[in-house]
């Protein structure tokens, strides 16, 4: 051990007054004193790997990760971050220690992760691992639970790194499909972190605290079920744990299960098997495939094979960053007044989204349902036939998505009228947007059939009330028209509505309200 170099890992926090991007070197900035990161040899690792205590910084913070090496002779080095190599310029301090730095300016989510520093000296080669994470500035967090195998036991531990400490529960169901809804009698809940009964059909773990509830389902391939028409797909982010369960039932114990990734058997230690007899004396076997922290090369087709069942596969896709895939083009709908209708958004997302539907500045709860093809759908039916603009908004920590909908309700116009000293105005909200006519009522035309050809000014859709278009028409009155009754009529394909106004009155005068359909 005394042959190994003496390594010191430090973090230097900078007072931000810069907007440059990160660089692997030293960089002049106002700095606080270096903070030791307790670099230690990583136990049981292949080669000499040192690890630094996890760095936790605020968004937009600027930091330097620095390594000081007491080793004779020259050193060469290379930084690697998310599979990209970054150049490295070591220098020597007054104590003749090798100094290697990585400056991260204006910390963002994309700059969080593992920074690997490879150092080569005349005596030895070694790696230093820095993990940089963004501190959650909000005091409370609720993180999606994940699974881990319990040491030396065939059991799963459910973990949610949340503040305040969450209540963790397993949600188990032995039925199929709809009967596994949360409040169904088929659902059993166990408020504990460790689960030993791993043979159930549907296994979920949920964590809840003041911020709400987050759940993770144990991804399962059931060889006794007819495969889905589309290949099941599982998304994970780099560094997350992968768990896939393969389940099969057979009349006796004479069958085995195996996992393959891209036609290659999984390595020892990446899977474990359990078996039990069911009540009707058939044998149930389950085989777990797991990776404690996935990398890009864990992407691929995971196939579960059995000597007595047709094999089935799932596509595991490892992404650097979460996503929400959906078409964001706005959609317009027109429906009848009593027609049943729901807005619908079809999307593919990872991690799972949180969403809201908004209408008239009011937010409505948003439900999402997983489809068989790997997509999810969120529907909103509670519009109560109110025309206007509806907004669907989704986010998952890594991505945001907004989609606009316009709902038009087909109905005949309804006219509102008002008059001032110089003009008369009528407005209507019917759909399709109405056209206008103005008629004069006189001795010659007691039924108000005499057209008023001049002084009319129509404004189609002149104001938008929460997306609801309103059409209006204004009559500028001449001296000759004062004291007369006029009639404004709005008409569309569904009917006509009129309002009569006395022109010398200062307010509305609904003398007669006609409806000619």
């Amino acid at each position: 051990n005394q042959d190994l170099p003496v390594i010191k890992c430090v973090l230097i926090n900078h007072k931000n007054n810069d907007s440059s991007v990160g660089k692997s070197s030293s960089y002049p900035m106002v700095s606080e004193s270096p903070e030791d990161l307790g670099c230690a040899l990583r136990p049981q690792s292949a080669g000499t790997v040192y690890e630094a205590a996890t760095v936790e910084v605020d968004v937009s913070a600027s930091i330097t990760l620095q390594v000081l090496v007491d080793t004779p002779g020259n050193i060469s080095c290379l930084w690697v971050f998310k599979h990209s190599s970054l150049n490295c310029q070591p220098h020597f301090d007054v104590q003749n220690r090798g100094v290697v730095s990585m400056v991260i300016l204006k910390m963002t989510e994309t700059q969080a992760g593992e920074y690997l520093l490879f150092i080569q000296s005349e005596a030895t080669n070694y790696t230093i691992v820095f993990t940089v994470s963004i501190r959650n500035t909000l005091l409370f967090t609720l993180r999606r639970p994940y699974f881990r195998k319990m040491e030396n036991q065939d059991a799963l531990v459910c973990i949610s790194e949340s503040v305040p400490e969450p209540i963790v529960e397993w949600v188990l169901c032995d039925s199929q499909g709809e009967s596994c809804k949360e409040e169904s009698p088929a659902v059993v809940k166990k408020e504990e972190k460790v689960l030993h009964e791993l043979f159930g059909t549907d296994i979920r773990c949920c964590a809840r605290n003041e911020l709400g509830r987050e759940c993770t389902r144990l991804f399962t391939i059931d060889l006794n079920q007819t495969p889905q028409t589309t290949l099941p797909q599982l998304f994970l982010k780099v560094g997350e744990p992968l768990w896939i369960r393969c389940k099969a039932v057979h009349v006796n114990h004479g069958f085995g299960l195996t996992w393959e990734l891209e036609n290659k058997a999984l390595e020892e230690g990446s899977y474990f098997e359990m078996s039990t007899y069911s009540t009707n004396r058939t044998m149930i076997r389950i085989l777990f495939a797991f990776v404690s922290s996935v990398a890009r090369n864990d992407t691929g087709y995971y196939t579960c094979s059995s000597s007595k069942h047709p094999s089935q596969s799932a596509l595991v896709t490892i992404v650097e960053k979460g996503f929400i895939n959906a078409t964001n083009s706005s959609e317009d709908y027109e429906i009848d007044q009593y027609e049943e209708f729901c807005f619908s958004v079809r999307f593919k997302a990872y991690p799972q989204i949180r969403c809201t539907w908004t209408f008239s500045r009011k937010a409505f709860p948003c439900e999402q349902k997983a489809l068989d093809d790997g997509y999810s759908v969120s529907k909103f039916c509670n519009h109560k036939h109110q025309p206007g603009e509806y907004i669907f908004h989704a986010e998952n920590g890594d991505a945001q998505f907004t989609k606009m909908f316009t709902l038009n309700i087909r109905r005949k116009p309804q006219v509102l009228a008002e008059a001032s000293a110089s003009q008369a105005s009528c407005s209507s909200d019917g759909y399709p947007l109405p056209s206008w006519t103005w008629k004069k009522c006189s001795d010659k035309s007691p039924n108000c059939t005499e057209d008023i050809p001049e002084g009319v000014w129509n404004r189609k859709a002149n104001r938008k009330v929460f997306g609801q278009w309103v059409s209006s028409s204004t009559l500028n009155m001449s001296e000759a028209m004062k004291g007369f009754l006029v009639k404004c009529c709005a008409y569309n394909s569904l009917g006509t509505s009129c309002e009569t106004i006395l022109l010398n009155s200062p307010g509305p005068f609904p003398f007669i309200q006609d409806s000619i359909s």
Partner: antibody, heavy 127, light 107 residues
Framework: QVTLKESGPVLVKPTETLTLTCTVS??????????VTWIRQPPGKALEWLAH???????SYSTSLKSRLTISKDTSKSQVVLTMTNMDPVDTATYYC???????????????????WGQGTMVTVSS | DIQMTQSPSSLSASVGDRVTITCRAS??????LGWYQQKPGKAPKRLIY???TLQSGVPSRFSGSGSGTEFTLTISSLQPEDFATYYC?????????FGQGTKVEIK
Amino acid sequence: QVTLKESGPVLVKPTETLTLTCTVSGFSLINARMGVTWIRQPPGKALEWLAHIFSNDEKSYSTSLKSRLTISKDTSKSQVVLTMTNMDPVDTATYYCARIPGYSRGWDYYYYGMDVWGQGTMVTVSS
Amino acid sequence: DIQMTQSPSSLSASVGDRVTITCRASQGIRNDLGWYQQKPGKAPKRLIYAASTLQSGVPSRFSGSGSGTEFTLTISSLQPEDFATYYCLQHNSYPWTFGQGTKVEIK
């Protein structure tokens, strides 16, 4: 250079509350996953783990002393404070604070125990 | 709570001797165990972490082994400065617990 220094009263009367302060330097209780732990050692006896606190405010306490202990931190002063209520002569001991770095592996945190210790402060409980 | 039983509680040895100290956990603790050396009037000092990884700057005559419930600290050739009390610590589950200590004395 990483240092931890314990401070507090040398003498405490039975039933009183003991307040100990650990002032740290050379590392941060804000910018890295670091913990500070308290351990005590009665004269001629073994070490006993009391409590710890991490940069994310995660806390743990000794089962037998949980009802009497409170641990907190003041990051602006780089201090961790331990209070122990209802002191008794059997609580006479040297009280140490020590550092626990936290390391990441995927989604997990790993702790390898205490890597740097303070020199300790002797507390006597007597009327 | 996990109990850590250290044996022997004390031993006498000469400079150059090979010394072995054992620590037994009341339940499996993987390799979440450290060994600490304490000299009279001084704070403990970490020798080994993760059951077998040598702390930087600690002489290579110290070594650790074991996993699960049985752990061993070995000093391959005892030196004058090694006469001290040695403690094991489990940090697998809360509360963390120390062994009762092994005092290594000069024969």
